[in-house]
């Protein structure tokens, strides 16, 4: 007998063929030989089954003895034998019919498992084998389980039912909800605005929560709340801000922050927060600031950063066009007695600048000019 | 819910291919037809030709000769070339799909044939 | 092919009307016919199907009837909305065949 398989909610064709290339009187049963349809002249008739709103053919098919039983909206309980009368002959044909989902919401937060779970007929022993977006290959029976879901999960997982030597295709589209980004990290010039962007790595239409901003400054001894802030509708609206800094955040998403100035009591450590409605958990983004100042007093000249930078990363005075007169992965450098001139304090990395602040030396007699 | 989008040229000349496709979003790719019509400027409906997911086609006598259908079912895709094109075949294209009745339809795509 | 004849193939009618077109086909074709709703620059919408099943979301105010070759569309109480052409299509056999219109305008 020949086999189908179909999947939940879809729509199947049955066939059955004729010799006679012509429109003959045809019916198709279920495996308790109650009538689904058939035809009477060219009348589509139906019988007395639980397929009656659901079972279809098409006419335009039995001129060629074609007598098609198409099903629509597939349940799992329509797995059964189902068999054609015509021309005084049966044809047999088994549907078994298979349904995959996601036992959870199918948006999930980082670092949340998925778990995939199989619908079958009683009687059937299918195989499934899913493949996620980032090409990783799960195998199991009538559940498969992916933990710790990565940003790279994202995406549409194909997975394969076998049954029979016959396979049917699932496509599942998976949103992992996160931040673009895990961490990122502002480099600025004490006084300079600084501007925190949080885009999200994920889009749905509407976006309902809440966060906050907590912030470990370097000089502190605790971290505190500096922002706390609703998002309805993708609407953002803030609840409670501090006074020293007071932030300003932007209404629309991606989330955005402004601090008015960077001041080296500033410099940090931050973690944003986000709680999503009907989700269990919180998305996070580490964010730092590095602040830089240049000055000079009396015969020094000093330029020091603060925040959290990397051992590796080189701070340096030089004069303008000139070769470094100090460079040290220190957190502050300084030369006594500098030269008149323009003079640049470099923080860099592998000789890439990642920040950058100008203090002219005047001849002895005058007083300092910060540019 | 289905919905079916189309695209393709729109501006030909006498004897080129018009080639069309229609991208299937949602919905069961299977068990149904996927057909095309067309109608010509201010004129009536003509069914151009029809593909199940398993690559089955039944097309117009008048067009067979010149018609291609087929179906790309892990794209949820089905396109249309028509060959040795003619003024005659300036028409808006549509893809539908058909289980003996058609719904529902794509946006369609102007075809002008002209030198 | 099947031959669709619809007729009249235009009429002017005013909102609140009761307004009938008619489609016959060259041969019985049972009940596999169906009817459609196209406005300007769109695409044709099915409305009735079978004959004589209206397609979820239709108004009420719309229904067909006919059987073997001779079928009607009915338009109970005409709405602004409801000015458009309307095609019949039959679904017995291979080509698919529609008549060839009638455009429904505002008296």
């Known amino acids: 007998k020949k086999v189908v398989l179909g999947k939940k909610g879809d729509t199947v064709e049955l066939t059955c063929t004729a010799s006679q290339k012509k429109s003959i009187q045809f019916h198709w049963k279920n495996s308790n030989q109650i009538k689904i349809l058939g035809n009477q002249g060219s009348f589509l008739t139906k019988g007395p089954s639980k397929l009656n709103d659901r079972a279809d053919s098409r006419r335009s098919l039995w001129d060629q003895g074609n007598f098609p039983l198409i099903i629509k909206n597939l349940k799992i309980e329509d797995s059964d034998t189902y068999i054609c009368e015509v021309e005084d002959q049966k044809e047999e044909v088994q549907l078994l019919v298979f349904g995959l989902t996601a036992n959870s919401d199918t948006h999930l937060l980082q670092g949340q498992s998925l778990t995939l779970t199989l619908e079958s007929p009683p009687g059937s022993s299918p195989s499934v084998q899913c493949r996620s977006p980032r090409g990783k290959n799960i195998q199991g029976g009538k559940t498969l389980s992916v933990s710790q879901l990565e940003l790279q999960d994202s995406g549409t997982w194909t997975c394969t039912v076998l049954q029979n030597q016959k396979k049917v295709e699932f496509k599942i589209d998976i949103v992992v909800l996160a931040f673009q980004k895990a961490s990122s990290i502002v480099y600025k010039k004490e006084g300079e605005q600084v501007e925190f962007s949080f885009p999200l790595a994920f889009t749905v239409e509407k976006l309902t929560g809440s966060g906050e901003l907590w912030w470990q400054a370097e000089r502190a001894s605790s971290s505190k709340s500096w922002i706390t802030f609703d998002l309805k509708n993708k609407e953002v609206s803030v609840k409670r801000v501090t006074q020293d800094p007071k932030l300003q955040m932007g209404k629309k998403l991606p989330l955005h922050l402004t601090l008015p100035q960077a001041l080296p009591q500033y410099a940090g450590s931050g973690n944003l927060t986000l709680a999503l409605e009907a989700k269990t958990g919180k998305l996070h983004q580490e964010v730092n600031l590095v602040v830089m100042r240049a000055t000079q007093l009396q015969k020094n000249l000093t330029c020091e950063v603060w925040g959290p930078t990397s051992p590796k990363l080189m701070l340096s005075l030089k004069l303008e066009n000139k070769e470094a007169k100090v460079s040290k992965r220190e957190k502050a450098v300084w030369v006594l007695n500098p030269e008149a001139g323009m003079w640049q304090c470099l923080l860099s990395d592998s000789g890439q600048v990642l920040l950058e602040s100008n203090i002219k030396v005047l001849p002895t007699w005058s007083t300092p000019v910060q540019p | 819910q289905v919905q079916l989008q189309q695209w393709g040229a729109g501006l030909l000349k006498p004897s080129e291919t018009l080639s069309l496709t229609c991208d299937v979003y949602?919905?069961?790719?299977?068990?149904?037809?996927w057909t095309w019509i067309r109608q010509p400027p201010g004129k009536g409906l003509e069914w151009i030709g029809e593909i199940n997911h398993s690559g089955t086609t039944n097309s117009n006598p008048s067009l067979k000769s010149r018609v291609t259908i087929s179906v790309d079912t892990s794209k949820s895709q089905f396109s249309l070339r028509l060959s040795s094109v003619t003024a005659a075949d300036t028409a808006v294209y549509f893809c539908t799909r058909e289980l003996n009745w058609f719904d529902p339809w794509g946006q369609g795509t102007l075809v002008t044939v002209s030198s | 092919d099947i031959q669709m004849t619809q007729s009249p193939s235009s009429v002017s009618a005013s909102v609140g009307d009761r307004v009938t077109i008619t489609c016959r086909a060259s041969q019985d074709i049972a009940n596999w016919l169906a009817w459609y709703q196209q406005k300007p620059g769109k695409a044709p919408q099915l409305l009735i199907y079978?004959?004589?099943s209206l397609l979820g979301g239709v108004p009420s105010r719309f229904s067909g009837s006919g059987s073997g070759a001779d079928f009607t569309l009915t338009i109970s109480s005409l709405h602004p909305e409801d000015f458009a052409t309307y095609y019949c299509?039959?679904?017995?056999?291979?080509?698919?065949?529609f008549g060839q219109g009638t455009k429904l305008e505002i008296k």
């Open positions: 299509q039959q679904a017995n056999s291979f080509p698919y065949t």
């Open positions: 079978a004959a004589s």
């Open positions: 949602g919905g069961s790719f299977s068990g149904y037809y």
